[in-house]
């Protein structure tokens, strides 16, 4: 169950698609990838205020109890609901093949 | 690829599955739910350090870029990795009912 | 496994517009890094790439060809379409089109032989 | 445009011996050459990525160098099915471009 997509705290401040850019430098992956040089990467990104894009019902406990005991239980975390498959062109043992990876870019985000 | 289990901060300190107990008004289940009263709830918490139990190839990205840009990307969080079914006796319009809820309690944790 | 599979018309005939199409499995045009493109190959000569088109819909044409090609894809049918207009017995040659993974071509169907002629 | 001229157009060989194409680029291409195999009747075959880097499943007699504007493809010991054409193609921005084949034949 998806729930309520409005963000009380303000514009772009709740749970969403960011998407960050990055070398391969930047992802540690400099010496097994080939390409590409630099990588549009999606993540899920902000606050999970209390229902907002909760995944499941054990999002709904969470919240509940995170209002009850703040600093024993932590709030919904924002997560990958879904991925967008990748490919990578990666060095081999004999040359280079082309990989494909499906949990790479996130695609949609939710609150768990 | 689930990385690393051990933790670099010290015992229990790492995502971690963990017992909250609850009442039926703690959960806001009251008006809706007669059985159980109180509930053993399991949840992921804890920090999610370099590798540890990544989930997968986005949450090593994660831990990637949270490090170069810490303001920027969060660390990755603990989250459940799968769950565990219940069942809830609840109140319907004609009396009750008995209701397997599957993604109530989590079973185990990663990261991501 | 990775299959490609060209089609047109055979024979067109000078002036027209030539219409192929590109179907393909094994792959998405969904997935980040992967594209279609196009070659193609006059009789006893070498190869010419055309064209190609981006899983996020960027597109890039050969120079000299730019004014007369149109490529466009439809993810969800596997396929991608390329058209090339006001054609002359020039444009006769053998038309393949490859799966791309980045600046990769490793996938390529057995071409469409095409005779412009009247 | 990028031009890739290659040399020799053909070149006329024996099973076993050892086979160099040359590739130059009218640019610097940095790496980005590609090599490819086509047979007669056939679609082009790809071999080499990044001037150096044999694709999955290529044979380690096939071979690739170079850098800059100069390139070579080498076949260590040739044998009976690498009787073929081969391309150059340089990736290294678009329009892509291929040279103009050398045709590997029976001596």
């Known amino acids: 169950a998806r729930n309520g997509d409005h963000c009380p705290l303000g514009p772009g401040r709740c749970c969403r698609l960011h998407t960050v850019r990055a070398s391969l430098e930047d992802l540690g992956w400099a010496d097994w990838v080939l390409s590409p040089r630099e990588v549009q990467v999606t993540m899920c990104i902000g606050a999970c205020p209390s229902q907002f894009r909760a995944a499941n019902m054990h999002a709904q406990i969470k919240t509940s109890l995170h209002r009850l005991k703040p600093d024993t239980v932590p709030a919904p975390c924002c997560v990958p609901a879904s991925y967008n498959p990748m490919v990578l062109i990666q060095k081999t043992d004999t040359g280079v093949s082309l990989q494909t990876y499906d949990d790479l870019l996130a695609k949609d985000c939710h609150c768990i | 690829a689930r990385n690393g289990d051990h933790c670099p901060l010290g015992p229990g300190r790492c995502c971690r599955l963990h017992t909250v107990r609850a009442s039926l008004e703690d959960l806001g289940w009251a008006d809706w739910v007669l059985s159980p009263r109180e509930v053993q709830v399991t949840m992921c918490i804890g920090a999610c350090p370099s590798q540890f139990r990544a989930a997968n190839m986005h949450a090593q990205i994660k831990t990637s870029l949270h490090r170069l840009k810490p303001d920027t990307v969060p660390a990755p969080c603990c989250v459940p990795a799968s769950y565990n079914p219940m069942v809830l006796i609840q109140k319907t319009d004609t009396g009750v009912s008995l209701q397997t809820y599957d993604d109530l309690l989590a079973k185990d944790c990663h990261c991501i | 496994q990775v299959t490609l599979q060209e089609s047109g018309p055979g024979l067109v005939k000078p002036s027209e517009t030539l219409s192929l199409t590109c179907s393909f499995s094994?792959?998405?045009?969904?997935?980040?890094?992967?594209?279609v493109g196009w070659i193609r190959q006059p009789p006893g000569k070498g190869l010419e790439w055309l064209a190609h088109?981006?899983?996020?819909?960027?597109?890039y044409f050969n120079t000299a060809l730019k004014s007369r090609l149109t490529i466009s894809k439809d993810t969800s049918k596997n396929q991608v379409s390329l058209k090339l207009s006001s054609v002359t017995a020039a444009d006769t040659a053998t038309y393949y089109c490859?799966?791309?993974?980045?600046?990769?071509?490793?996938?390529w169907g057995q071409g469409t032989s095409v005779t412009v002629s009247s | 445009d990028i031009v890739m001229t290659q040399s020799p157009a053909t070149l006329s060989t024996s099973p076993g011996e050892r086979v160099t194409i040359s590739c130059k680029a009218s640019?610097?291409?940095?790496?980005?050459v590609a090599w490819y195999q086509q047979k007669p009747g056939q679609s082009p075959r790809f071999l080499i990525y990044?001037?150096?880097y044999r694709y999955t499943g290529v044979p380690d007699r096939f071979s690739g160098s170079g850098s800059g504007t100069d390139f070579t493809f080498t076949i260590s010991s040739v044998q009976s099915e690498d009787f073929a054409v081969y391309y150059c193609?340089?990736?290294?921005?678009?329009?892509?471009?291929f040279g103009g084949g050398t045709k590997v034949e029976i001596k």
């Open positions: 990044s001037s150096s």
């Open positions: 094994g792959f998405s045009l969904s997935t980040y890094g992967i594209g």
């Open positions: 640019q610097d291409v940095n790496t980005a």
């Open positions: 490859a799966r791309m993974g980045y600046d990769i071509m490793d996938y």
């Open positions: 193609q340089q990736h290294y921005s678009t329009p892509w471009t």
């Open positions: 088109i981006w899983w996020n819909n960027n597109k």
